[in-house]
């Protein structure tokens, strides 16, 4: 009688958990005349066996991490050894159990971050691997910060993406990190499998040393310019610098002046492009912006203040 565990020779797929000692047959193939014996070939790994009568079984526990799928072929042979049916493909899919620990690729990581870096922008990745199936919770990793040293006012300056292991600054970290006060930090980071959701999960830890570097993206001191300068223009009046080379600089005039007499070059040097007249306008406020190669702002705009100084160029009026 055909059923769950017996039937004719045809392509079939079976799923078996790894790590389990064999407890029952996989399948009993029924022979059609003149088949008197069965033959098993393919990725048997000396684990899978078929008896003459068509009883397919395995003789020891499987390991998915050694082979996740066993591609076998079964043929039915007659008394002369002639294949009379098949060979047909028999696929054994080995189902995963949580039998492997996650492991960090490094026991120690080192990185650096600029003060005032954008919150949530990764500056370092930690990475762990787990040999278990990433399509199951067994191989799904969950990263978290265990300790931050020093911990000032109980405020976390660093955060980690639980899924990717990307480390970035928190909002507080972006605002408060100051290399002059504290130039280095240490994080202890853990990784757990089972998506971090199970008491039975395996874990590993790693250490991360972080150096905080100075942010040179700072607003320059206010500039004072003498009106009606006769020097050749443009004249460099100040500069801004992004923390890394390759930034694209621009100026933003929020006042929408009919005449905006300032420019910036790709070194971050700011120029006045024509003589200024204090009687026309005695102060300018505009912004310097740094963008990446895709035109995305790298940080907040810097406010530039220019004050126009008077010269005695107007007669008194009664």
């Amino acid at each position: 009688q055909e059923g769950k565990f017996s039937g004719p020779l045809k392509p079939m797929t079976f799923s078996i958990y790894e790590g389990q000692e064999p407890s029952q047959i996989i399948f009993q193939f029924k022979a059609n005349p003149p088949a008197v014996t069965f033959e098993l070939t393919g990725e048997t790994d000396n684990i899978f066996v078929i008896e003459r009568e068509g009883l397919l079984y395995y003789n020891r526990a499987l390991d998915r991490e050694t082979r996740s799928t066993h591609n076998l072929q079964v043929a039915a042979l007659d008394a002369n050894g002639i294949i009379v049916e098949g060979p047909v493909p028999i696929t054994i899919k080995v189902k995963d159990i949580n039998d492997n620990r996650p492991t960090f690729l490094q026991s120690k990581y080192e990185g650096s971050v600029r003060q005032n870096s954008r919150p949530g922008k990764p500056f370092l990745y930690v990475n762990a691997t787990d040999l278990d199936d990433p399509a199951t919770p067994n191989g799904q990793l969950y990263y978290q910060i265990v300790i931050q040293l020093p911990m000032i006012n109980n405020v976390m300056y660093f955060q980690i993406n639980n899924k990717t292991g990307a480390i970035s600054l928190t909002r507080e970290g972006s605002q408060e990190l100051n290399p002059a006060k504290n130039p280095s930090y240490n994080l202890v980071i853990s990784v757990k499998d089972m998506g971090g959701q199970s008491e039975n999960s395996f874990s590993d830890t790693t250490s991360v040393d972080i150096i905080v570097t100075e942010n040179i993206w700072k607003a320059p001191k206010p500039v004072e310019m003498v009106e009606n300068s006769t020097d050749p223009h443009p004249i460099k009046i100040t500069q801004v610098r992004w923390n890394d080379p390759g930034a694209q600089y621009s100026l933003v005039d929020k006042e929408k002046l009919p005449r905006f007499p300032f420019s910036i070059d790709q070194e971050g040097d700011i120029y006045v492009t024509q003589p200024l007249d204090r009687e026309e306008k005695d102060a300018y406020v505009f912004y310097a912006v740094a963008k990446d190669e895709y035109g995305k702002p790298l940080s907040y705009p810097l406010e530039i203040h220019v004050k126009v100084k008077d010269i005695n160029d107007n007669p008194p009026t009664c």
């Epitope: 059609n32 005349p33 003149p34 008394a79 050894g81 294949i83 009379v84």
Partner: antibody
């Protein structure tokens, strides 16, 4: 409906040759091992040749070995039996029969007479 | 070679009779036995395979049994269309061999 139709039988002199054909239809011929069985009044039914589904393996009993050759053309769904050095005792009705699922399908037979 | 001895070689029976045909192998054939029917016109049909499994479309009045060396084909209630010659066939060992046949005739 499964059909096996033999042809090519007839009268042949001892030492002569004959080629039998069997046209198959109604089943997946290329998946089946096939065979020729003969029936004589004296010896009854006797297996004379077997070929596997792709033509890679053949089997003959000692009575016909080295004289008969079984072959197949799966593209034409046809089985063949080349008979050489024929003897009087090869006189029989020759049946084409499925070997996979042994004896499930049979042709109507073709008569081969070996006589001077 | 394995010899297959069939008995009787012929029998006469009437419609409705119970008919039993036996086949004895010269050695154990592990149940690897088929039963065939050949009508007077020459057409051959398999009735039973692997000792006792009925082919599809074969009436339930036919049954097969046996083990080791002794096997039986039984027709529980003979019908007019059952008058034919019956052969056993062993496929346990090469060369496959047939019994000599049992001709069932009308009494």
């Amino acid at each position: 409906e499964v059909q096996l139709v033999e042809s090519g039988g007839g009268l042949v002199q001892p030492g002569g040759s004959l080629r039998l054909s069997c046209a198959a239809s109604g089943f997946t011929f290329s998946s089946y091992a096939m065979s020729w069985v003969r029936q004589t009044p004296g010896k009854g039914l006797e297996w004379v040749a077997v070929i596997d589904s792709n033509g890679g393996s053949t089997y003959y009993p000692d009575t016909v070995k080295d004289r008969f050759t079984i072959s197949r053309d799966n593209s034409k769904n046809t089985l063949y039996l080349q008979m050489n050095s024929l003897r009087a005792e090869d006189t029989a009705v020759y049946y084409c029969s499925s070997y996979t699922n042994l004896g499930a399908y049979w042709g109507q037979g073709t008569l081969v007479t070996v006589s001077a | 070679d394995i010899q297959m001895t069939q008995s009787p070689s012929s029998l006469s029976a009437s419609v409705g009779d119970r008919v039993t045909i036996t086949c004895r192998a010269s050695q154990d054939i592990s149940g690897y036995l088929n039963w065939l029917q050949q009508k007077p016109g020459g057409a051959i049909k398999r009735l039973i395979y692997t000792t006792s499994t009925l082919d599809s479309g074969v009436p339930k009045r036919f049954s097969g049994s046996g083990s080791g060396t002794d096997f039986t084909l039984t027709i529980s209630s003979l019908q007019s269309e059952d008058f034919a010659t019956y052969y056993c066939l062993q496929y346990a060992s090469s060369p496959f061999t047939f019994g000599g046949g049992t001709k069932v005739e009308i009494k």
